[in-house]
C-alpha cells in the first residue's frame, strides 16, 4: 500500500520532476472553498496579502484564483511503476504577480510577489482523492499538503493514503 506513504513513494522525485514546457497546459479561474464550504479569501493588509478561511455572508462575492496547470513527467524508477508517469501540477494566483507559496520552514502558506519562472515553492501536485474535491501537495516537500488550521491555510503532513481523504486538506473549485 502507501507504505513509504504512496504519496511519498511516488512523489519522492518531485524535487527532480521536470515540468513539461514552461507554459501551462490550461488555466482556469475559480473560487476556492474548503470541504465544509468555507471560502478562501485574500485581503491586502499593510502592503502584503493575508489569506483567510471564512464563512461569507449570503450575497458576498467569492474571491477568484487563477489556477495554471502544468504537466510533469516522472521517471518510472522513482514512482515504482513500470512506465514513466505524468502528474498534474498547479500554481495558484489570486491577483496579478502574486502566487501561493509553501513556506516549509514555518509550515505556512503565503502569498508572494514574484516573476516567472516561478520557484518550486509555488508548485503543487494536484490530487483528486475524493469525490469532486482536490488536494494540493507541495512540490518541495512530498507528503505535505495545503490544509486548513485555525481558520488559516497551513501546511499539513500526511503520512498515509487513508489520510488523503481527511477533510482539512480537501478543497472545492467552483466558477461561481
Amino acid at each position: 500500500a502507501f507504505g513509504i506513504s504512496g504519496v511519498q513513494k511516488y512523489t519522492r522525485a518531485l524535487h527532480d520532476s521536470s515540468i513539461t514546457g514552461i507554459s501551462p497546459i490550461t488555466e482556469y479561474l475559480a473560487s476556492l472553498s474548503t470541504y465544509n464550504d468555507q471560502s478562501i479569501t485574500f485581503a491586502l493588509e499593510d502592503e502584503s496579502y493575508e489569506i483567510y478561511v471564512e464563512d461569507l455572508k449570503k450575497d458576498e462575492k467569492k474571491d477568484k484564483v487563477l489556477l495554471s496547470y502544468y504537466e510533469s513527467q516522472h521517471p518510472s524508477n522513482e514512482s515504482g511503476d513500470g512506465v514513466d508517469g505524468k502528474m498534474l501540477m498547479v500554481t495558484l494566483s489570486p491577483t496579478k504577480d502574486f502566487w501561493l507559496h509553501a513556506n516549509n520552514k514555518e509550515h505556512s502558506v503565503e502569498l508572494h510577489k514574484c516573476e516567472k519562472p516561478l520557484p518550486d515553492q509555488a508548485f503543487f501536485v494536484l490530487h483528486n482523492m475524493h469525490s469532486n474535491c482536490v488536494s494540493f501537495e507541495c512540490k518541495t516537500d512530498p507528503g505535505v499538503f495545503i490544509g486548513v488550521k485555525d481558520n488559516h491555510l497551513a501546511l499539513i503532513k500526511v503520512d498515509s493514503s487513508e489520510n488523503l481523504c481527511t477533510e482539512n486538506i480537501l478543497f472545492k473549485l467552483s466558477e461561481t
Epitope: G6, K9, T26, S79, K86, H127, M129, H130, N132, S161
Partner: antibody, heavy 121, light 107 residues
C-alpha cells in the same frame, strides 16, 4: 508496460449478481485511479464508476444502488460488483486507468480488452 | 449530473476531407474533456485530453478545442481507418459522463 485485464463470468442469470476482476500490471493501484466503463450492444459508452488511488469510490448516479467497486492494492486487482442484473445490463465491460497520477482530469489512456457479460435465462 | 450532448450522431464524409464533431456540456467543465475513438471489437483509445492535448502516439490530424461548455473535435484529411465511432467525456465532476457518440461513415 501498463496492462489491464478483465475477467468475468460471461453469462449471468437475470436478478443475479455480477463480479468482474480487473488485474493490472506495470503500475501501482496506490498511484492511479481505475474506472469501469461498459458498452451495451448498439449503444454508447457508459461510465460506471471509479476507485481512486486513495481508495474512495464514485459511481454512476443511476446505478449507484447496485454497484460496488473495491480493490486489493497488494494483489493489483480492482473488483466491480453489481447486483440485480437485468437483460439491459448485457454489455462489454472495461476497466481503464487514469492518465495522471492521483487524479482523473486527463482521461484514460490505458484500457483492458473488455469482458462480455450476457444477462440471460 | 453533467449532461454531454454530442453531435452529429452520425456523419458521412469522403477520404481526405475534414470533419468536426461538437460536444456541449450542460454546465461548465473548464477544459476537462477527453475524446476517444472506438473501433469495432476494440477498446476505446484516448485521442485528446484536457480539451486540446494530443495523447501519446496519436496522429496530428486529430485536434481538439474549446473550454467551458462548448467543445470541438476535428479530423483533418480523413484516412480509411478513421471511419469509426468517437466519444467525448467530461472529467470535471463525477459522475464522469460520456457523450452519445458520433459514427463516421464513408460517403
Amino acid at each position: 508496460q501498463v496492462q489491464l485485464k478483465e475477467s468475468g463470468p460471461g453469462l449471468v442469470a437475470p436478478s443475479q449478481s455480477l463480479s468482474i476482476t480487473c488485474t493490472v500490471s506495470g503500475f501501482s493501484l496506490t498511484n492511479y485511479g481505475v474506472h469501469w466503463v461498459r458498452l451495451p450492444p448498439g449503444k454508447g459508452l457508459e461510465w460506471l464508476g471509479v476507485i481512486r488511488a486513495g481508495g474512495s469510490s464514485d459511481y454512476n448516479s443511476a446505478l449507484m444502488s447496485r454497484l460496488n467497486i473495491r480493490k486489493d492494492n497488494s494483489k493489483s486487482q480492482v473488483f466491480l460488483e453489481m447486483n440485480s442484473l437485468q437483460t439491459a445490463d448485457t454489455a462489454m465491460y472495461y476497466c481503464a486507468r487514469d492518465h495522471y497520477f492521483s487524479n482523473s482530469y486527463g482521461g484514460s489512456p490505458y484500457w483492458g480488452q473488455g469482458t462480455l457479460v450476457t444477462v440471460s435465462a | 449530473d453533467i449532461q454531454m450532448t454530442q453531435s452529429p450522431a452520425s456523419q458521412s464524409a469522403s477520404l481526405g476531407e475534414s470533419v468536426t464533431i461538437t460536444c456541449l456540456a450542460s454546465q461548465t467543465i473548464a477544459t476537462w474533456l477527453a475524446w476517444y475513438q472506438q473501433k469495432p471489437g476494440k477498446s476505446p483509445q484516448l485521442l485528446i485530453y484536457a480539451a486540446t492535448r494530443l495523447a501519446d502516439g496519436v496522429p496530428s490530424r486529430f485536434s481538439g478545442s474549446g473550454s467551458g461548455t462548448e467543445f470541438s473535435f476535428k479530423i483533418s484529411s480523413l484516412q480509411a481507418e478513421d471511419f469509426v465511432i468517437y466519444y467525448c467525456q467530461q472529467l470535471y465532476n463525477t459522475p464522469y459522463t460520456f457523450g452519445g457518440g458520433t459514427k463516421l461513415e464513408i460517403k
